[in-house]
Structure formats: C-alpha cells, structure tokens
Amino acid sequence: DHHHHHHEQKLISEEDLRADPCAARPCAHGGRCYAHFSGLVCACAPGYMGARCEFPVHPDGASALPAAPPGLRPGDPQRYL
C-alpha cells in the first residue's frame, strides 16, 4: 500500500519518485525540473521565485533571479527536494 503523491491528476508511487524525482512535475509556473544528486532542481521562469517556483515575484522587489546556492553557478537552476 504505497503512499502516493498527486500532481496534475497523476498518481506517482514513492518508488517512481525516487527513480525520477521530476516525475511529479513539482516545478510551478513553467519552471523546469532537473534531476540532481540531492533530489531535484527547479529552474524558475522569469518572474517567479521559491524552491518550486510557486511564488510570483513582486515587481518592486530586488532581482527576480535568486542568488546561486553554493555549488551552483549563477543561472543554474534552484535545487529542491
């Protein structure tokens, strides 16, 4: 009896997620998902922020692009999960 994640009407088992952490399509608003040694990476489309690109950036805020975390070059996707 596997616990399942639900995303866009798709049920995905924990085993599937471990094999392909991008299977659940976790990156919102057109963010691109990349498999990564620590799980997955969301590269946010311009104007979005957050680990899963779930937040629209307020236009008066600072740069919409997050600073690259250690080990990732600027412009590289954000890691998540």
Epitope: G39, C42, E54, V57, A62, P69, R79
Partner: antibody
Framework: QVQLVQSGAEVKKPGASVKVSCKAS????????MHWVRQAPGQGLEWMGI????????SYAQKFQGRVTMTRDTSTSTVYMELSSLRSEDTAVYYC?????????????????WGQGTTVTVSS | DIQMTQSPSAMSASVGDRVTITCRAS??????LAWFQQKPGKVPEPLIY???SLQSGVPSRFSGSGSVTEFTLTISSLQPEDFATYYC?????????FGQGTKLEIK
Amino acid sequence: QVQLVQSGAEVKKPGASVKVSCKASGYTFTSYYMHWVRQAPGQGLEWMGIINPSGGSTSYAQKFQGRVTMTRDTSTSTVYMELSSLRSEDTAVYYCARGEAVGGNYYYYGMDVWGQGTTVTVSS
Amino acid sequence: DIQMTQSPSAMSASVGDRVTITCRASQGISNYLAWFQQKPGKVPEPLIYAASSLQSGVPSRFSGSGSVTEFTLTISSLQPEDFATYYCLQHNSSPYTFGQGTKLEIK
C-alpha cells in the same frame, strides 16, 4: 542555536505605518527564505508574504499588495516587514518564520523556526 | 486561493484519548501540508511536515497522514500538554493558506 528575535510591541494610529524587524542568528541568513505570518486577537494564522534574503526578491499575498514591503539587511542578518495605511483590523501579532533553504534540500522543513512575535496595536 | 478547512473547529477530549483532526484542501496539494500546535499566548510550534513526517523533537504520539485533498493529524494518547489549538498549512501554491484551527480542550 537557530533563533529569530523580533522588535518590540508597537502602538500606531490609523493611517500610519509600522516596520517590524526580525534578526536571525545561528544559521546562514541568506540560505533560507523568510515568511511573515500574522494573527489577529482570537483569530487564526494568516500568511502575508515571503522574502529571499539572498537576492531580496519578494512575493506578497494579494490581500496585502500595495501596503506591505519586505526588505532585508544582510549585514545585520535582519529582515523587515513594513505595513502602511494601518487600520484597526491590522491589530495583530506579527511573526517571522524561517522557510525553506534557498538552495533547496531533500526535505521541506519550512517554517521550522519562528520569531517570538511582535504585537501591533492600531488605535485612535 | 486554496481553502483549507479543518474539522472539527473545537473538540473536548480526555487524557489518554486518541484524537484525530482533519484538514481538507479545496484542490489537490500533493503532500505539501504541515501541522502546527499553538498554545495560548505562545508561538506556533511545527509538528509535521510533508503531511506525515515528524519535525525534530516532536513526540511520536503525533502522526500525520493523507495526500491530495484529505489530511489527518492523530494524537495516539493525549497528554496534558497537548491541549492547544492545531493548524494545518498548505504550502503547495501561493498564497500559502492555513486552516482556521482546531481547539482541543480538556473534557
């Protein structure tokens, strides 16, 4: 230890602005998002918005758009939440809460550490 | 916005009871759900993240389950310090939204 220390209580007149601070210690300030949540007397919790302390980008709940501004000072590891055009309904306890790692991590532990809260009273 | 509906809004129980609180999301949120405990005049304390994972230091009598739109927080054997208000939080999409709270009182 990881700690968020907020500024003291404020009493404001309707129409005024208030700026609440939240000083982080015990972890790398720029590596975690920061949320702001408020709670009116006897009411539930309400999410206001989020700031990325690294780049300074923000996102606000629609309800507060145009009235709230979240900023940060990386030199002092402090985030600020300013709310303008105050009205009596803004009387609440305002909390900062640490969110997810900016760089991501395998699990979500978001809002795992909260400030002690800042009481803002709006009264004429 | 995603609406989070908790039930019951309030309940009374006795020490040693098994208690279940439900949180329903108005649309699917995968397992992006957290639970918090708040005592009067105190700061919310995180209990559960990712619907079913216990935050560090939280007693094992607390457990979470569910996915998509239906979630539960269970306290297997109520202790005196568990009487408080409990909130669920969806962090699937912006704006993050909390349930209205469930106040757990001593019977």
